[in-house]
Amino acid sequence: SQVSQNCHNGSYEISVLMMDNSAFAEPLENVEDAVNEGLEIVRGRLQNAGLNVTVNASFMYSDGLIHNSGDCRSSTCEGLDLLRKISNAKRMGCVLMGPSCTYSTFQMYLDTELSYPMISAGSFGLSCDYKETLTRLMSPARKLTYFLVNFWKTNDLPFKTYSWSTSYVYKNGTESEDCFWYLNALEASVSYFSHELSFKLVLRQDKEFQDILMDHNRKSNVIVMCGDPQFLYKLKGDRAVAEDIVIILVDLFNDQYFEDNVTAPDYMKNVLVLTQSPGNSLLNSSFSRNLSPTKRDFALAYLNGILLFGHMLKTFLENGENITTPKFAHAFRNLTFEGYDGPVTLDDWGDVDSTMVLLYTSVDTKKYKVLLTYDTHVNQTNPVDMSPTFTWKNSKLPNDITDRGPQ
């Protein structure tokens, strides 16, 4: 049946899917607070532009009977059920905000004819790449693989003079939703990361990981994993590590490394942490006071999703263009809009661009220090610390294969 869009005559609505299965275990009231804060900003911006329109959100909740595991991996049908609910109510906004689970987003794309834009705080997996009406506001797996390949190949940094072409990947299946899809993209034989490496092996058992740390016959000195320092400690403990091992810990949505009083534990000295530049303006906002650093990024993505909706609404209304058209549905990409914490750039496929930051532990200060930045928009690595105080020999990253010598 035909669903009417509440999206004309000066009244514009965004439908927000409030799903039990979410990329981050975030109370739905926090998501609602983020959306409402975003709406307030959008109303102000539209008013300042002389656009006298009404903007609201309708929150669509799951009934919670079937899908209440809270685990993204059982989310496949929940999004479709919510869409059915919208369809039965014959009420749809101009834009759909959610879902955040990759399975759910993929299934919605597979099984529906989406003629309206969809904004997701998540949907990290490669299967959600290149979707014409999907916008993702948290770094998807594709962006991570581009960084890793760029970094592996780089051999002209003051602290990295070897190209790498090998890696171990630790993936035990208990990871968070973002980590699950990041590692999935590294594991996939068809992925860019796999394609560019001459050797890659996935370690699935704790013991496999622990054995590699001192194995003289290992095929690579580099291990990629995903999680926070505590996750690494549970796995590695205080075990000895060969001097030329480099662990890359992917922890994109964690601001704790930038806090003033943070000291890096000793077990982090062989580790490079890949995270993102911190946002700080959310710290003072009403809904974020009780959020962990990770959840802050999730809430911010929802808030920015509303601001993106407002930006597109303003652009189309100012140009006198219709909102309920395929042009509007396909317009949420290749643009920069004013986010809550500064400008936000979306690439040609509607995926957020960001600055990734590689940190190391200074052996002098025991603090996390920025080694380099990587701008996903231009695929460019920039060194920040020209003389890092590394644990590795000569304060340079080792070769990925022991005793191979300079190439």
Epitope: D156, P158, F258, S277, P278, T336, G342, P343, T345, T355, V357, V370, T373, Y374, D375, H377, N382, P383, V384, D385, M386, S387
Partner: antibody, heavy 118, light 110 residues
Framework: EVQLVQPGAEVKKPGSSVKVSCKAS????????ISWVRQAPGQGLEWMGR????????NYAQKFQGRVTITADKSTSTAYMELSSLRSEDTAVYFC???????????WGQGTLVTVSS | QSGLTQPASVSGSPGQSITISCTGT?????????VSWYQQHPGKAPKLMIY???NRPSGVSNRFSGSKSGNTASLTISGLQAEDEADYYC??????????FGTGTKLTVL
Amino acid sequence: EVQLVQPGAEVKKPGSSVKVSCKASGGTLSSYAISWVRQAPGQGLEWMGRIIPILGITNYAQKFQGRVTITADKSTSTAYMELSSLRSEDTAVYFCARDQRPASMDVWGQGTLVTVSS
Amino acid sequence: QSGLTQPASVSGSPGQSITISCTGTSSDVGGYNYVSWYQQHPGKAPKLMIYEVSNRPSGVSNRFSGSKSGNTASLTISGLQAEDEADYYCSTVTSLSTYVFGTGTKLTVL
């Protein structure tokens, strides 16, 4: 195409401070660094310091350490350079420039002439 | 950190080639492949001509080239033209993650 816009001129008294702004128009400060470089009349270029706005990381030339503060406001894509305890020899044109790569300043502001005079 | 050493002036006739040197230490020029060269006309902002020792930004004539040997970097301008008359500065990073400029060279086209 990013342009860096600076105010034209400032006149200051010895001992006071000056805060020069540098706004990125037609783009954002992004992950690039913004350097501040000064040039006294008839003299060469002198690097003062830089900031990576997205991280708030700063580096200062030893000569200016303790007297210069570089900040940035991501939301307005504006960088600032504040120089305190001004003396007559600080009279110079102060440029901001975008570091696209280390020590590669590819976009420059038009410069702000700061005159320190009693 | 005092400036990198450049000759105060160089000159050449139209069509000739000239080279400007930039000498530092192993903690700056010698230690990193991040040497840049700038051209500055009177009353104007500097313009990036060479970055990372030998790379030219788009729009810069291929008459400009850069190189480095040990602690000394060089800028070569071939087929000298009247509009090349300007001040030229080198710059590089240091082991302190700061930058330093050269003392500057005035190029005169005779």
